[in-house]
């Protein structure tokens, strides 16, 4: 079945209340424009936004009779010229009949004859309808032929895109048949279909077919108020195929359309032949698109690559929600125009300022104000991280402006990272010097403490993403952060006293839930050494609080459970609701604060892993006055387990010197290897292995320069910890570097038990853990341990 | 073919004004834009303003704010160009010029010579 | 004083390339297109390229633009006596929301 046979059907069904063979009709109210219901209009109760109201009529070809419901009686079948007359198309009838077309649709023959009702005649220009009626003969024939076809076709055999010839020099008539049911002809629509005749068939047509011969190249040749449109179509080498055969829509801007645009916007447009073309290139579809088959919102993809929603009004038509056209359905022989009269803007033609919404206002204006804007050179390369308005305080915008520079220049990258280039671990630049740490979670994407909005747009010199807070940099390590806060100086040296003040303060990515001093209310400092006296259960109770990953609060799909695993090896449980995070459904007093190693979420109480019993009857009394939320077990005589703190620590290679350094000059054309030992680097990012994201940790003992050397390499040892020694040595070994891999898979970052995987590699004195493999692998120089 | 026809030469004194036309055939004048350039003797040009045919919305030259003013009237097809408050380095060629925006200043008129002289 | 500086002679003998170069800002020529205008002695200003490199119907293809940076030029080959002009190159200037044209270049033909 074809749209136009469904949406009858759909029609038929609303209006067998009424009778056999009734259909429902909607009338757009304050017109006389009706259509067969849609499920979809039907249910709206509107077409174009505007309400309609139920009409009930026969189905085509069925009609009533006296006395009886509904519309029982089939309509008589007649020739052609007779079925004009039961339609109701009397005009298209007697112009039949004065034009001598008459004899020959009564005849011999199978014609298909799109016949314009009596109203679309009366629409018609007086001056040209005037031309027709004094030339009958000739004029009025040619038109009258040309809304014939040789050939009985229903409109299910009226496929979109066809052209078919009709019975005037073979002029083409363009059929549109759309997914709601709209079939058009040059874009006049089929308001009755299908009333067959002994010799053919007639579809009422709501216009009369004027005559085409030219092409939109043409059009826009002929046409002095689309000159500027015309213009900027030669520049951008796009005239000569608006000349081609195609089934375009062309939305043509007219001059006063150009007028309205800023004079600097299109003076860098037209300078610009990417952005020109793609300002020309979002006006043309590659699809035909009448008026009248628009009866809602529908995107269309231009030949620009970016789509458009046009929409309609009443019997106003809008481009993205704004009503623009003026003048609807220019008939081609190569597709239609619709004059508008404003200019459409794609994002590719806009510099990456231009495409800020009104959500991001106070960003673009601090921007300019600040003098940002001006270092976003037109053919430089950047990314806005904009932050909507209302993430701007009172507090902020009245801040020195040289603190609210250096804040703004933190949303400001130095390259163009478009949505689907950012990844977990990934580290941007701003143009600040700064370094923002990307979060990829399952249903947002951070950086730092700020999430992204919808919203994401690329320009021609960059990129825009929307935040829904000002982003802030870390600047302190976890210990330091806790530090500096007197609300966590008992959770502190219960850290200190577990020997984990390292892990806080190395570089990595946690996720630490730290427990004010609140949640030690009552603890005397009996208790207090008996926690520390028990070195495993301290580690154990500490280590519960620490995930590896960062996962930030606003990062959480709002109201689902996140299941983590936690250093100490029990799941924890996270939820985000109401902006507040739950933690083992436990409020978080304060959550997301950055650090450079991760991020703290504030806890008023102790976390107690729910899985582990505990074996002392003191220390479960201790627990049981600081840990409310859960019933924690007792089991008499067991033991907390020892973790393995090597999985966390990093691996330090260890160089032998053998003998005393070799001094020699080193004569000219001799180049030095040199080894630079750092701090361990701890990178993390995700990659797709298998369809599965895998969480990739790579820990490296050193960073490596290399200046090449032809026969003699040095390796010069920094041994760090405040020592100056150097020490010289004859390299011996090949082996320069030896890199530790953690690999840490599941599904995105909920780490369950078997999923867990571990490589070690290298000589590092660990305790073998039993669940994992351990790996001597090759030397492998990475990209991030080579440094220029 | 496109012509701009201006008015003829005048000679005004100092603190004085000067309105000059500029009337437009061969082309519909609703659909273009006009701009003004004038051209101070042995100098270069310079840019006063621009006026829509259409809308009679107007862009001046921030420097010429407040003394010049731009008009059209489109039953003529003229466009009109006042400056106010002359001075004697107003003395120029003023030029009208067909103003697409996308294609600028394609057509222009022969020019008007104005004298600021005491 | 013009905002786009330009050499203020160039000459060359018929049948040879002149080049004629245009320098401006980031706000003017950096940020916009570049158009050039001639005028002959005693008449009026003529349109001789728009948007950089476009010529109008009716100029010959012996005029060509281009622009690269804050920086633009206009090249004549096939140099005639009939091309002795001054040459303007002009620009959108977004900082001062005017149009600047260039102090021109007198092209002699040798």
């Known amino acids: 079945n074809s749209y136009y046979d469904k949406v009858l059907a759909h029609s038929r069904i609303r209006g067998r209340d009424q009778g056999p063979n009734v259909c429902a009709l909607q009338q757009i109210l304050g017109t006389k424009k009706k259509y067969f219901s849609s499920c979809k209009n039907w249910y709206q109760g509107a077409i174009c936004g505007k309400k309609t109201t139920v009409l009930y009529e026969c189905c085509p070809g069925y009609m009533r009779m006296e006395g009886m419901k509904g519309c029982p009686a089939v309509m008589p079948i007649d020739h052609v010229y007779g079925t004009l007359g039961i339609v109701g198309a009397t005009t298209t009838q007697h112009y039949s009949d004065v034009s001598k077309l008459r004899e020959e649709i009564e005849g011999k023959g199978s014609y298909t004859y799109f016949a314009p009702s009596n109203e679309a005649w009366e629409n018609l220009d007086s001056d040209i309808r005037r031309g027709l009626e004094n030339n009958v003969n000739v004029e009025l024939l040619n038109a009258l032929h040309s809304h014939m076809v040789n050939k009985r076709m229903l409109t299910k055999d009226l496929k979109h895109g066809m052209v078919i010839p009709s019975m005037y020099n073979n002029l083409g008539l363009f059929i549109n048949h759309y997914p709601n049911g709209v079939v058009t002809v040059n874009c006049a629509r089929v308001i009755h279909g299908n009333q067959i005749a002994t010799n053919g068939v007639v579809h009422v047509i709501d216009r009369v077919l004027t005559q085409i011969g030219t092409s939109i190249q043409d059009f826009l040749e002929a046409e002095d108020d689309l000159s500027s449109f015309r213009a900027a179509a030669i520049t951008s080498d796009l005239l000569e195929s608006l000349g081609r055969d195609g089934h375009f829509t062309l939305f043509a801007p007219t001059n006063e359309a150009f007028e309205k645009l800023p004079r600097g916007v299109l003076e860098r447009i037209m300078g610009d032949k990417v952005a020109s073309e793609a300002l020309m290139k979002y006006h043309i579809l590659n699809t035909l698109q009448c008026s009248e088959a628009i009866t809602g919102g529908a995107v269309f993809e231009t030949m620009e690559g970016n789509t458009i929603e046009i929409g309609c009004e009443g019997d106003s038509i809008s481009i993205n929600g704004i009503k623009m056209v003026n003048k609807k359905d220019i008939v081609t022989k190569n597709g239609v125009i619709h004059l508008i009269d404003e200019v459409l803007i794609p994002d590719s033609a806009k510099q990456v300022i231009e495409l800020a919404g009104k959500q991001q206002t106070t960003f673009t204006d601090l921007v300019a104000q600040l003098g940002l804007a001006s270092s976003l050179k037109p053919d430089g390369e950047y990314t806005l991280l904009a932050p909507v308005n209302n993430a701007f305080s009172d507090d902020t915008l009245s801040m020195d402006q040289r603190l609210l520079k250096l804040i703004l220049q933190n949303h400001i990258l130095k390259v163009k990272v478009g949505l689907s280039d950012l990844y977990n671990g990934q580290i941007l630049e701003t143009i600040g010097g700064k370094q923002l740490r990307v979060f990829v979670y399952r249903t947002a994407i951070c950086i730092e403490n700020s999430c992204m909005v919808r919203g994401s747009k690329q320009g021609r010199n960059g990129a825009i993403h929307i935040f829904r807070e000002i982003i802030q940099p870390a600047e302190k390590s976890l210990h330091d952060k806790l530090r500096q806060d007197k609300r966590f100086s008992i959770f502190l040296s219960l850290l200190e006293a577990a020997d984990l003040k390292d892990l806080l303060t190395q570089p990595g990515d946690w996720t630490l839930f730290a427990p004010t001093n609140d949640a030690f209310k009552g603890m005397t400092s009996e208790e207090r050494e008996l926690l520390i006296g028990d070195k495993n259960a301290l580690q154990n109770i500490i280590l519960y609080h620490l995930t590896p990953g960062v996962y930030i609060g606003k990062g959480f799909e709002p109201g689902v459970t996140n299941i983590l695993k936690t250093t100490q090896g029990s799941k924890i449980y996270l939820k985000g609701v109401n902006e507040t995070l739950l933690v083992n459904e436990l409020k978080s007093k304060e959550s997301d604060i950055m650090t450079t190693n991760g991020v703290i979420h504030v806890v008023d109480k102790l976390l107690y892993p729910a899985d582990i019993p505990v074996g002392n009857d003191q220390l479960l009394e201790l627990l049981n006055k600081l840990i409310k939320y859960i019933q924690i077990k007792f089991v008499r005589g067991s033991t907390f387990k020892e973790i393995p703190m090597t999985v966390y620590r990093p691996a330090m290679t260890k160089i032998q010197i053998e003998g005393d350094p070799d001094f020699r000059l080193i004569k000219e054309g001799e180049t030095v290897t040199e080894v630079i030992h750092g701090e361990p680097v701890i990178k993390k990012y995700t990659k797709i292995i298998d369809g599965v994201p895998v969480e990739i940790t790579e820990k490296q003992t050193r960073e490596e320069r290399i200046i090449t050397g032809p026969e003699i390499k040095y390796t010069r040892i920094s041994t760090g910890g405040g020592e100056t020694g150097e020490t010289l040595q004859k390299f011996l070994q090949k082996e320069v570097s030896k890199v530790t891999k953690f690999i840490e898979g599941g599904d995105g970052h909920l780490f369950e038990d078997e999923e867990i995987k571990r490589l070690l590699q290298g000589d590092t004195p660990a305790k073998k853990i039993p669940a994992n493999k351990r790996v001597q692998g090759p030397r492998r120089r990475s990209r991030e341990g080579r440094s220029q | 073919q496109v012509q701009l026809v201006q008015s003829g030469a005048e000679v005004k004194k100092p603190g004085a004004s000067v309105k000059v036309s500029c009337k437009a055939s061969g082309y519909t004048f609703t659909s273009y834009g006009i701009s003004w350039v004038r051209q101070a003797p042995g100098q270069g040009l310079e840019w006063m303003g621009w006026?829509?045919?259409?809308?009679?919305?107007?862009n001046y030259a921030q420097k010429l704010q407040g003394r010049v003013t731009m008009t059209t009237d489109t039953s003529t097809s003229t466009a009109y160009m006042e400056l106010r408050s002359l001075r004697s380095d107003d003395t120029a060629v003023y030029y009208c010029a067909r103003d697409m925006l996308v294609v600028p200043f394609d057509y222009w008129g022969q020019g008007t010579l104005v004298t600021v002289s005491s | 004083q013009s905002v786009l500086t330009q050499s203020s002679s160039a000459s060359g003998t018929p049948g040879q390339t002149v080049t004629v170069s245009c320098s401006g800002s980031s706000s003017d020529i950096g940020s916009n297109r570049v158009n050039w205008y001639q005028q002959l002695p005693g008449t009026a200003p003529k349109l001789l390229i728009y948007s950089n490199d476009q010529r109008p119907s009716g100029v010959p293809d012996r005029f060509s633009g281009s622009k690269s940076g804050t920086s633009a030029s206009l090249a004549i080959s096939g140099l005639q006596s009939a091309d002795e002009a001054d040459y303007y190159c002009a620009a959108w200037d977004d900082s001062l929301s005017t149009y600047v044209f260039g102090s021109g270049t007198k092209v002699t033909v040798l």
């Open positions: 006026i829509s045919a259409y809308s009679g919305n107007t």
